[in-house]
């Protein structure tokens, strides 16, 4: 059977050209966005940055797996990036976009 | 056909007896923990409380679904509960446990 790895951060480089955003984003050309994936299975160890609720949900899932899902693997720390882009009036704008880069993942 | 509902909060009452915790937790007997479940599919509307990263990840998933998963539905707001319990020395303790109740969910 497929045994997914435990919840963790995976590397992902996102190219703005691939997203079709190259006409309005001047710089950067892309960025290391990363993503979270993996199992949040019992027992939730310290690496999994689990909330108290996630711990409770995991125990309830084990008792009642048909109705209550496992917690999911989601970002716990996100960073911003600065983007240079054209606005609707073709002005060049430098803006900081929050919550763009995954720095850490956990079970939520 | 499989049409999973969009990411949202679901009601869940957790009984401490069901968890086998009745011998050390005096009160409450249980609590409304709730949980998050549902799809984080394109387009991520305002109800889904999506982060910028989740929006980017959704677009990357559409391009490359085998490699990058959809964002997951996780708590965005959590509340504490107060618990009266026996410690290891049989002292009665009142403690506030953080992040025990899901108040809102979103795509992360």
């Amino acid at each position: 059977s497929e045994l997914k790895t435990a919840c963790k951060k995976h590397e992902l480089y996102v190219s703005f050209q691939d997203l079709g955003w190259q006409d309005w984003i001047i710089a950067p050309k892309g960025y290391a966005a990363n993503y979270c994936d993996g199992e949040c299975s019992f027992p939730l160890n310290a690496h999994m940055n689990a909330t108290n609720h996630a711990i409770v949900q995991t125990l309830v899932h084990l008792m009642n797996p048909e109705y209550v899902p496992k917690p999911c693997c989601a970002p716990t720390k996100l960073n911003a990036i600065s983007v240079l882009y054209f606005d609707d009036n073709s002005n060049v704008i430098l803006k900081k976009y929050r919550n763009m880069v995954v720095r850490a993942c956990g079970c939520h | 056909s499989e049409l999973k509902t969009a990411c949202k909060k679901h009601e869940l009452y957790v009984s401490f007896q069901d968890l086998g915790w009745q011998d050390w937790i005096i009160a409450p007997k249980g609590y409304a923990a709730n949980y998050c479940d549902g799809e984080c599919s394109f387009p991520l509307n305002a109800h889904m409380n999506a982060t910028n990263h989740a929006i980017v990840q959704t677009l990357v998933h559409l391009m490359n679904p085998e490699y990058v998963p959809k964002p997951c539905c996780a708590p965005t707001k959590l509340n504490a509960i107060s618990v009266l319990y026996f410690d290891d020395n049989s002292n009665v303790i009142l403690k506030k446990y953080r992040n025990m109740v899901v108040r809102a969910c979103g795509c992360h």
């Epitope: 059977s1 497929e2 045994l3 997914k4 199992e39 299975s41 019992f42 027992p43 125990l59 084990l62 008792m63 009642n64 797996p65 048909e66 109705y67 496992k70 | 056909s1 499989e2 049409l3 999973k4 509902t5 679901h10 069901d18 479940d37 549902g38 799809e39």
Partner: antibody, heavy 121, light 112 residues
């Protein structure tokens, strides 16, 4: 009282198709996860697959032995569960049961009486 | 080959105690999932006997009890009666995709 009644079984040739139904009554069918379980003559119970409730988006899952050949669906307005069986093989010969999953501990608390499917040339 | 392993048969005299084991692995019982037990009398559909590893549905006599430890579970029947002669199945979940798994079944024979 809770009742599950299967129908649609019978004799079918290898490669053929059959659709089983499971009529539910005595409970709010739409709120429950329901499964198909089969039992070959003189053998043990074998899980076939399940469909979740409306809250969980009717998501389905199947045993490896039937994946791609069998399809589970449900019509909550008719309180009925279905099992569409295609490309049937002789090893699919069995009594097919539908079973309801109780909501607190996920046990199969109610079963139908079963319907016999015989795949033979 | 079933995912959960049960002895094919057990037997006991009326009034005796018998136990039926159910051995799994780290991806099912060992992952923490509950175990349920079903009784199947000859020619009938299975019936839920023990749920949540150790709880009895209403109407099930307290002669039946269940327990779970590590990667195994067991069903105990005390004060064996002739009407207990049946097939018994354990059931749990596989953690990778939360799919149902059954034991191969155990035939209980009440002697004499």
């Amino acid at each position: 009282q809770v009742q599950l009644v299967e129908s649609g079984g019978g004799l079918v040739k290898p490669g053929g198709s059959l659709r089983l139904s499971c009529a539910a009554s005595g409970f709010t069918f739409s709120s429950y996860v329901v499964h198909w379980v089969r039992q070959a003559p003189g053998k043990g119970l074998e899980w076939v697959g399940r469909i979740k409730d409306h809250k969980q988006g009717y998501t389905t899952a199947y045993a490896a032995s039937v994946k791609g050949r069998f399809t589970i669906s449900r019509d909550d307005s008719k309180n009925t569960l279905y099992l569409q069986m295609n490309s049937l093989k002789t090893e699919d010969t069995a009594v097919y049961y539908c079973a309801r999953v109780e909501r607190s501990k996920s046990g199969f608390d109610n079963w139908g009486q079963g319907t016999l499917v015989t795949v033979s040339s | 080959q079933s995912v959960l392993t049960q002895p094919p048969s057990v037997s006991g005299a009326p009034g005796q105690r018998v136990t039926i084991s159910c051995t799994g692995s780290s991806s099912n019982i060992g992952a923490g999932y509950s175990v349920h037990w079903y009784q199947q009398l000859p020619g009938t559909a299975p019936k839920l006997l023990i749920y949540g590893s150790s709880e009895r549905p209403s109407g099930v006599p307290d002669r039946f009890s269940g327990s779970k430890s590590g990667t195994s579970a067991s069903l105990a029947i005390t004060g064996l009666q002739a009407e207990d002669e049946a097939d018994y199945y354990c059931q749990s979940w596989d953690s990778s995709q939360t799919l149902v798994v059954f034991g191969g079944g155990t035939k209980l024979t009440v002697l004499g």
